[in-house]
């Protein structure tokens, strides 16, 4: 009789994760009698994948009916393939015995698993950064195979170049992960901006996965302050306004100081949004000029998003106004949070709202 051959016709097989893999094996002779076993890997540490004679292998089925007479086809089908199934599979013929004796191995079939990358997750800085500063965004995707992958960053559709990307592990593995960091320069116009991490892989059939992050979560746009005096009213009261413009986020506290003493503190809330996503706020203070002998120094102090306070001062000239008798009020604070302040914004910005 001619020598038995164990034939594994495919050197390699590539399968998408979740699919079934067929590993082909035929023998050239019914002689000698004895079982076929399938192993992953070679040598003493090899892993038994299927043994026709005995054992429970729920994911593995014989392609041909093993009880069929003259059967020389010992191909197997492994269901629900995962990246962990990657490796080289050997079809091994044994001679019947007590125990069965290994006789001959096929050349092996390398199973590679095409696994899709997970949806990219983009994370920004833990704390907000002020506009005109640079912040880092990271993008992570896991579980893909093969290792080749392309990752691109975009800001408002424009590709970013200050990017550092790593694919791990460096050596052979059943699956891989990618981590990329992009450095993004924030501008005052970036409240509505978005960064996109785009991942392209052979398993995605040209339809890349995208992860996004809104710069609104990362940016702080500090306010501009302007304090102005309206014309004197007939009752000797001067209306002083503090215009706080183009800030983000909304978290802002405004304090009026008269000659260094706190007159009123207000918190911004439910402000309408400008087109660019920033906010404006106008607060006013009525100063009774006739109650003062000397000029009054008014200070509008703004604390924005937990940052150090910013001040803008304005002097109301008392000497220019005749003193009215019988008044003992230094400054009249008619404003509550609602009545004492008015929302200032351009008409252009009226109907634009910002969503987080």
């Amino acid at each position: 009789e001619e020598e038995l051959q164990v034939i594994q016709p495919e050197k390699s097989v590539s399968v998408a994760a979740g699919d079934s893999a067929t590993l082909n094996c035929t023998v050239s002779s019914l002689i000698p009698v004895g079982p076929i076993q399938w192993f992953r890997g070679a040598g003493p540490g090899r892993e038994l994948i299927y043994n026709l004679k005995e054992g429970h292998f729920p994911r593995v089925t014989a392609v041909s009916d093993p009880t069929k007479r003259n059967n020389m086809d010992f191909s197997i089908r492994i269901s629900n393939i995962t990246p962990a199934d990657a490796g080289t599979y050997y079809c091994v013929k044994f001679r019947k015995g007590s125990p069965d004796v290994e006789l001959k191995s096929g050349a092996g079939t390398e199973l590679s698993v095409r696994a899709k990358p997970s949806a990219p997750v983009v994370s920004g800085p833990a704390v907000r950064a002020t506009a005109e500063h640079t912040v880092s965004f990271t993008c992570e995707s896991h579980g893909f195979s093969p290792r080749d992958i392309t990752l691109k960053w975009f800001k408002n559709g424009n590709e970013l170049s200050d990017v550092q990307t790593n694919v791990d592990p460096a050596g052979k593995s059943v699956s891989y992960s990618i981590r990329s960091t992009a450095r993004v320069l924030l501008t005052r116009r970036d409240v509505h901006s978005q960064v996109i991490c785009e991942v392209a892989h052979v398993t995605l059939q040209g339809d890349p996965l995208r992860g996004t992050a809104n710069l609104s979560e990362a940016i702080r746009v500090p306010p501009f302050l302007e304090v102005t005096q309206q014309s004197m009213r007939a009752d000797n009261q001067v209306n002083v306004t503090c215009q706080v413009t183009k800030f983000y986020p909304q978290r802002l506290q405004l304090t009026w100081l008269e000659n260094g003493n706190v007159s009123r503190t207000e918190m911004a809330s439910a402000l309408p949004e400008n087109k660019d996503g920033t906010y404006n706020w106008t607060s006013w203070l009525l100063v009774n000029v006739s109650a003062h002998r000397d000029d009054v120094k008014l200070t509008c102090q703004v604390e924005h998003d937990g940052q150090p306070a910013v001040n803008k001062s304005f002097s109301v000239k008392v000497s220019a106004h005749p003193k009215e008798q019988g008044s003992n009020t230094a400054a009249e604070n008619t404003g509550t949070n609602e009545r004492g302040s008015s929302d200032y914004k351009d008409d252009d910005d009226k109907h634009h709202h910002h969503h987080h």
Partner: antibody, heavy 119, light 110 residues
Framework: QVQLVQSGAEVKKPGASVKVSCKAS????????INWVRQAPGQGLEWIAM????????HYNQIFKDRATLTTDTSTSTAYMELRSLRSDDTAVYYC????????????WGRGTLVTVSS | DIVLTQSPDSLAVSLGERATINCRAS??????????IFWYQQKPGQPPKLLIY???NRDSGVPDRFSGSGSGTDFTLTISSLQAEDVAVYYC????????FGQGTKLEIK
């Protein structure tokens, strides 16, 4: 280690039925044919039938086609052979045997079950 | 149906001598490049034991003094040097179609 353990001896009256069991161990029961063979006292071997436990496909010797029924219980890895309308010449040792090479041969044998048919 | 006829029915051979048992099929048992003949040994009070499969292949654990030969319709089991423990009845079986056995050959020591 492949083992086939058969049920104990039976004494039956003519016209009765007998059901012999064969419990398999040491291998995957559904992957190999089970044959039944009998041997009358001082006589040769006579093949009765075979069954594939995976799908209960059976092949019978024409002589026994109308009187023998093979079944299996895969949950207990047990094969059964029932012989009906017993006659005195059915007195024999009944063997189960496993076909390890799918060659329609008998590689591993049970110890046999003696069935005596006597009035 | 294929009928197998063994010869002789019984045989006495001296220890250390060659024993030869023949099996003739009523039609060829060759198919798919194989001769579908098997040889069994049965000792008193024991089940049969497979010796040779597909005409010429010793089963595992079978001493190499046992050999099988033949093709088509005529087959031979040979014991090259008879040992005391070889006393038994020997059966041929075919599986070209559904199995049948030869009538058996009783081997004794002369």
């Amino acid at each position: 280690q492949v083992q086939l353990v058969q049920s104990g001896a039976e004494v039956k009256k003519p016209g009765a039925s007998v059901k012999v069991s064969c419990k398999a161990s040491g291998y995957t029961f559904t992957n190999y044919w089970i044959n039944w063979v009998r041997q009358a006292p001082g006589q040769g071997l006579e093949w009765i039938a075979m069954i594939d436990p995976s799908d209960s496909e059976t092949h019978y010797n024409q002589i026994f086609k109308d009187r023998a029924t093979l079944t299996t219980d895969t949950s207990t890895s047990t094969a059964y052979m029932e012989l009906r309308s017993l006659r005195s010449d059915d007195t024999a040792v009944y063997y189960c045997a496993m076909d390890y090479g799918s060659l329609y041969a008998m590689d591993y044998w049970g110890r046999g079950t003696l069935v005596t048919v006597s009035s | 149906d294929i009928v197998l006829t063994q010869s002789p029915d019984s045989l006495a051979v001296s220890l250390g001598e060659r024993a030869t048992i023949n099996c003739r099929a009523s039609q060829s048992v060759r198919s798919s490049g194989y001769n579908w003949i098997f040889w069994y040994q049965q000792k008193p009070g024991q089940p049969p034991k497979l010796l040779i499969y597909l005409a010429s292949n010793r089963d595992s654990g079978v001493p190499d003094r046992f050999s099988g030969s033949g093709s088509g319709t005529d087959f031979t089991l040979t014991i090259s040097s008879l040992q005391a423990e070889d006393v038994a009845v020997y059966y041929c079986q075919h599986s070209r179609e559904l199995p049948t056995f030869g009538q058996g050959t009783k081997l004794e020591i002369k």
